[in-house]
């Protein structure tokens, strides 16, 4: 005969464990139902009654099957240098990541606690290592024969144009000036940009205004800068 299915709460067989999505209640000494994500235990089980679950209260969440008496509080609203990549819902915490042009100087379990602006390399210096979501730009002095005339977190040092006749020699922060109108270098004179760090988040160029006077998907429609390193500036 097939084993009889036990309905919670039930006393487990000696040496056995409770089933998936159940927990052992020490007080009742019974296997009892867990609450689903987005809920918490409002009333714990007894020998004769199962766990009573309730929805998480506003701005709180539970991500896992659980028997916690209170849901966890969502993190604070994202700051103006951040983008909310995951909203606070009953089943998940808010996640804030840094907006473009910033990197995460202090991370937390998910998302970022503190964003800082990417370092800008000043004229005479170019980007040696581009910024990422979690690391700052590294600047380096432009080597002889190269220059950067911009203050930028993406521009690298570019070679001087090669002149038939030099009017003004180039230096680390200025291109060479030729007397002839036809320099021999074939490179386009425009600045060379490194790509911004790849990011899955939405590419806002402005800080997102707070909170919610922008329409949210919400009711009823049917429808501290890093200290400047040598060759860098702050914002």
């Amino acid at each position: 005969l097939p084993a009889q299915v036990a309905f919670t709460p039930y006393a487990p067989e000696p040496g056995s464990t409770c089933r998936l999505r159940e927990y052992y209640d020490q007080t009742a000494q019974m296997c009892c139902s867990k609450c689903s994500p987005g809920q918490h235990a409002k009333v714990f089980c007894t020998k004769t009654s199962d766990t009573v679950c309730d929805s998480c209260e506003d701005s709180t969440y539970t991500q896992l099957w659980n028997w916690v008496p209170e849901c966890l509080s969502c993190g604070s609203r994202c700051s103006s240098d951040q983008v909310e990549t995951q909203a606070c819902t009953r089943e998940q915490n808010r996640i804030c990541t840094c907006r473009p042009g910033w990197y995460c100087a202090l991370s937390k379990q998910e998302g970022c606690r503190l964003c800082a602006p990417l370092r800008k390399c000043r004229p005479g210096f170019g980007v040696a290592r581009p910024g990422t979501e979690t690391s700052d730009v590294v600047c380096k002095p432009c080597a002889p024969g190269t220059f950067s005339n911009t203050t930028s977190s993406t521009d690298i040092c570019r070679p001087h144009q090669i002149c038939n006749v030099v009017a003004i020699p180039g230096n680390a922060s200025m291109d060479a000036v030729c007397t002839s109108t036809s320099p021999t270098r074939s490179m386009a004179p425009g600045a060379v940009h490194l790509p911004q760090p790849v990011s899955t988040r939405s590419q806002h160029t402005q800080p997102t205004p707070e909170p919610s006077t922008a329409p949210s998907t919400s009711f009823l429609l049917p429808m501290g800068p890093s200290p400047p390193a040598e060759g860098s500036t702050g914002d």
């Epitope: 506003d58 819902t89 919610s212 009823l220 429808m223």
Partner: antibody, heavy 120, light 108 residues
Framework: QVQLVQSGSELKKPGASVKVSCKAS????????MHWVRQAPGQGLEWMGR????????KHDPKFQDKAVLSSDTSVSTAYLQISSLKAEDTAVYYC?????????????WGQGTLVTVSS | DIQMTQSPSSLSASVGDRVTITCTAS???????LHWYQQKPGKAPKLLIY???NLPSGVPSRFSGSGSGTDYSLTISSLQPEDFATYYC?????????FGQGTKVEIK
């Protein structure tokens, strides 16, 4: 754009009931609460209760538990406040306001208010 | 219930003045759950500051908020003619959610 438009002023006799509506547009019913707040003439704001339109779950100030019934009809994007056994002291402007889930209860949009006058 | 007591109940000030309104809770309130509203006569309240110190889009930067625990404040750094109104603090920390009694800011 987000809008909450409430029904017009009401003049009621003591003992009667009134049902105030709040029609929402510009946003949908996911993760939002609709609150009702009343303001007696010359007085401050008093939170009465709120409804989660997605589930119909309500929460009241105990003071209004037997006085106010909150409901909503998502098919017409409208929340309702029904007040029963009206007394002169229920004369007030009644506001609906929304708070998005996760905004810690900040009521970011309000209806224009509905004046309910109770007089014999 | 958590009682919210605002101080002062009313004040008279001139354009350009710095004005501070305080709100004291009868028990501790998490700073995320403390908000301020502005109401002008005959109009609906408007969210002015949320979560103690954050300004919604469109609210001028002369408004600021601070505080923690039971003591919170709203400051207007340089009062403008359009700021004459009544201000309410609001706690959403524990139900029933409650408002302060209001502070009326009048022209001196």
């Amino acid at each position: 754009q987000v809008q909450l438009v409430q029904s017009g002023s009401e003049l009621k006799k003591p003992g009667a009931s009134v049902k105030v509506s709040c029609k929402a547009s510009g946003f949908n019913n996911k993760d939002i609460y609709m609150h009702w707040v009343r303001q007696a003439p010359g007085q401050g704001l008093e939170w009465m209760g709120r409804i989660d339109p997605a589930t119909g779950n309500t929460k009241h100030d105990p003071k209004f538990q037997d006085k106010a019934v909150l409901s909503s009809d998502t098919s017409v994007s409208t929340a309702y406040l029904q007040i029963s056994s009206l007394k002169a002291e229920d004369t007030a402007v009644y506001y609906c306001a929304r708070s998005p889930y996760g905004d810690f209860g900040a009521m970011d949009y309000w209806g224009q208010g509905t004046l309910v006058t109770v007089s014999s | 219930d958590i009682q919210m007591t605002q101080s002062p109940s009313s004040l008279s000030a001139s354009v350009g003045d710095r004005v501070t309104i305080t709100c004291t809770a009868s028990s501790s309130v998490s700073s995320n759950y403390l908000h301020w509203y502005q109401q002008k006569p005959g109009k609906a309240p408007k969210l002015l500051i949320y979560s103690t110190s954050n300004l919604p889009s469109g609210v001028p930067s002369r408004f600021s908020g601070s505080g923690s625990g039971t003591d919170y404040s709203l400051t207007i750094s340089s009062l403008q003619p359009e700021d004459f109104a009544t201000y309410y603090c609001h706690q959403y920390h524990r139900s029933p959610w409650t408002f302060g009694q209001g502070t009326k800011v009048e022209i001196k």
